[in-house]
C-alpha cells in the first residue's frame, strides 16, 4: 500500500467575494474516523478549529464556518462566511487533519493562491506522481535520479505542447501554475514550489484487540490503490502559494475518541508517554 496523502484546496467563490470554500481529501486505503479543519495553523499547534466531521455521528462547526459537509467518503468541504471587509481569509492558512486507521493522522495545510481570481481554482485534478513506495526499492538516490529524470521529461514534453493541459481557460486573466507533490520527496516538493514544506513523522498505532464494532463497519474508500511498487497514484494539484504539511502521526486531540469500556485501538501520540485516549474508529 502507498503512503497516504491529504490534499487541501482553498477557493474564493466567484459570486460572493466574501465567501470561501475549503476542500480537503484523503488519498489512502484506510477508513477515516474523523476530520478536523482549522485555520491559522495546524490543529493543536496554534490553529483554531473551524469544524470537526465524523463520518457517522455528524459534524460540528463554529463561526466563521457556514457549512461543513462530506463531499465523498474521503473528502470534505467547508464553506466560510467572511464578514470582515478586509477579507482576512485571503491570507489565512487552512489545515485539514484526517484521522484514519491504520495510518494514524495526516494533516495538510493550504491557503488561497496569492493573486488568484475569484472562482479560478479548478477542482483538484489528479496527476501521476512518483510513489513513495519506490524509495524502499530503489533507495533514496535512485528515487531522486528518477525524479529528476521524470521532471526533465515533463519539462521537455511541456515545451512541445502549445496549450498546457492544466491551464485554466484563456478568458482568465491569470493562469494558475499547478504542481504535483509527493509527500515523501522533499527535494521534489522544493523544486516545484518554494512555499511547500514537508513534515513527516511516523508513530504506529497498535491494535490491542479487535473491536466487534470497529473499522470493518466503516466502508473502505475509493482511493487509488497502486498495483505494484512502480504504480503511480493520483495526487490533486495544489495551487501555487499553497503551504503543505503532512504528518503521519496519531491524533492526540481531535482525532481521538474519549475512552469507553471495551477493547479497541490504542494510540500512542508520540511513540512514548502515557496511553492516549481510545475510542471506536481507531481511537477508543
Amino acid at each position: 500500500a502507498g503512503t497516504p496523502e491529504v490534499w487541501v484546496q482553498v477557493q474564493m467563490e466567484a459570486t460572493e467575494l466574501s465567501s470561501f470554500t475549503v476542500h480537503c481529501g484523503f488519498l489512502g486505503p484506510g477508513s477515516i474516523s474523523l476530520v478536523t479543519v482549522s485555520w491559522g495553523g495546524p490543529d493543536g499547534a496554534g490553529g483554531t478549529k473551524l469544524a470537526v466531521l465524523h463520518p457517522e455521528l455528524g459534524t460540528r462547526q463554529w463561526a466563521p464556518a457556514r457549512q461543513a459537509r462530506w463531499e465523498t467518503q474521503s473528502s470534505i468541504s467547508l464553506a466560510l462566511e467572511d464578514s470582515g471587509a478586509s477579507s482576512p481569509f485571503a491570507n489565512t492558512t487552512f489545515c485539514c487533519k484526517f484521522a484514519s486507521f491504520p495510518e494514524g493522522s495526516w494533516e495538510s495545510c493550504g491557503s488561497l493562491p496569492p493573486s488568484s481570481d475569484p472562482g479560478l481554482s479548478a477542482p483538484p485534478t489528479p496527476v501521476p506522481i512518483l510513489r513513495a513506495d519506490l524509495a524502499g526499492i530503489l533507495g533514496l538516490s535512485g528515487v531522486l535520479l528518477f525524479g529528476c529524470g521524470y521532471l526533465l521529461h515533463l519539462l521537455r514534453r511541456q515545451k512541445h505542447r502549445p496549450t498546457p493541459r492544466l491551464q485554466p481557460s484563456h478568458t482568465n486573466s491569470q493562469a494558475l501554475t499547478a504542481q504535483a507533490w509527493a509527500p515523501s520527496q522533499a527535494s521534489q516538493a522544493a523544486l516545484h514550489d518554494p512555499y511547500a514544506t514537508i513534515n513527516t513523522s511516523f508513530c504506529p498505532a497498535t491494535l490491542d484487540t479487535a473491536h466487534p464494532n470497529g473499522w470493518a463497519s466503516l466502508p473502505t474508500h475509493a482511493a487509488h490503490q497502486p498495483q505494484g511498487p512502480a504504480a503511480s497514484a493520483s495526487t490533486p494539484i495544489l495551487a501555487r502559494g499553497s503551504f503543505v504539511s503532512v504528518e503521519n502521526g496519531l491524533y492526540t486531540q481531535a482525532g481521538e475518541r474519549p475512552p469507553h469500556t471495551g477493547p479497541g485501538l490504542t494510540l500512542f501520540p508520540d511513540c512514548r508517554g502515557p496511553r492516549a485516549l481510545e475510542g471506536r474508529f481507531g481511537v477508543r
Epitope: T48, K49, H54, L57, G58, R60, W62, A254, E256, P258
Partner: antibody
Framework: EVQLVQSGAEVKKPGSSVKVSCKAS????????IEWVRQAPGQGLEWIGE????????NYNEKFKGRVTFTADTSTNTAYMELSSLRSEDTAVYYC???????WGQGTLVTVSS | DIVMTQSPDSLAVSLGERATINCKSS????????????LAWYQQKPGQPPKLLIY???TRESGVPDRFSGSGSGTDFTLTISSLQAEDVAVYYC?????????FGQGTKLEIK
C-alpha cells in the same frame, strides 16, 4: 473512563440567573464541544447549544440566544452554562454532553419557583 | 429547524416480542456526498441521562445488545428491538444529527404488555 460530572440541584426565583457546571475527565477537554441539553419534567430533550473549550467558540439554539452564556475553563476542564431571566418554564433537568451526545453528565435539576 | 416526529407516542409489547418505533424527519438526513444518514437513537430510563444506542441510522454503539437495530434512509427511520427484555423499558428518542440545531423527536415510551 470518560466522566462528565455536573453541579447539584438549584432552586431559583423567577428573574434570577443560574450557573450550572460540568467537569469533564478522561479525555482531552478541548478536543470536542460540550453540548447542553435540557429536559422539562415529563417532556422531551431540547438542545440549548454548545461550546468548544479552548477556543470558546459557541453555537446557540435561537430560542435561548441572549439568555444563555457558555464558558469553559480549560485549566479545570470545566464547562459552565448560565441561564438568566429565569421563568417557571425553565424548570428542567439540564444535561451536559460531549462527543456527539455519546457521553452525558448526570443532570442538574433547576427549579424556578417564587 | 428539522422537525423529528416519532410514532407511536407509547407502545406496549410482550416480553420476547418485537418492538418497532418509527421516526420521520421534516427534511432528509441523508448526506448525498458519503451516502450516510445522520440520525441517532437514544434510550432514557427514569432518573438517568439518555444513552446513545444507534448512530448513522444503523450503527450500534459499543456495548449495545444486538437485539437493537436501526434502519431507514432519507426521512423515514425505524428502531427495532427484536426480542423485548424487561430492561428495555424506557423512553426512546430519535435525533437529527444532520444539521444545526440538533433536534430530537418527542419520544416513545416503551412498556411491557
Amino acid at each position: 473512563e470518560v466522566q462528565l460530572v455536573q453541579s447539584g440541584a438549584e432552586v431559583k426565583k423567577p428573574g434570577s440567573s443560574v450557573k450550572v457546571s460540568c467537569k469533564a475527565s478522561g479525555y482531552t477537554f478541548s478536543s470536542f464541544s460540550i453540548e447542553w441539553v435540557r429536559q422539562a419534567p415529563g417532556q422531551g430533550l431540547e438542545w440549548i447549544g454548545e461550546i468548544l473549550p479552548g477556543s470558546n467558540s459557541t453555537n446557540y439554539n435561537e430560542k435561548f440566544k441572549g439568555r444563555v452564556t457558555f464558558t469553559a475553563d480549560t485549566s479545570t476542564n470545566t464547562a459552565y452554562m448560565e441561564l438568566s431571566s429565569l421563568r417557571s418554564e425553565d424548570t428542567a433537568v439540564y444535561y451536559c454532553s460531549s462527543y456527539w451526545f455519546a457521553y452525558w453528565g448526570q443532570g442538574t435539576l433547576v427549579t424556578v419557583s417564587s | 429547524d428539522i422537525v423529528m416526529t416519532q410514532s407511536p407516542d407509547s407502545l406496549a409489547v410482550s416480553l420476547g416480542e418485537r418492538a418497532t418505533i418509527n421516526c420521520k424527519s421534516s427534511q432528509s438526513l441523508l448526506n448525498s456526498g458519503n451516502q450516510k444518514n445522520y440520525l441517532a437513537w437514544y434510550q432514557q430510563k427514569p432518573g438517568q441521562p439518555p444513552k446513545l444506542l444507534i448512530y448513522g441510522a444503523s450503527t450500534r454503539e459499543s456495548g449495545v445488545p444486538d437485539r437493537f437495530s436501526g434502519s431507514g434512509s432519507g426521512t423515514d427511520f425505524t428502531l427495532t428491538i427484536s426480542s423485548l427484555q424487561a430492561e428495555d423499558v424506557a423512553v426512546y428518542y430519535c435525533q437529527n444529527a444532520h444539521s444545526y440545531p440538533p433536534t430530537f423527536g418527542q419520544g416513545t415510551k416503551l412498556e411491557i404488555k
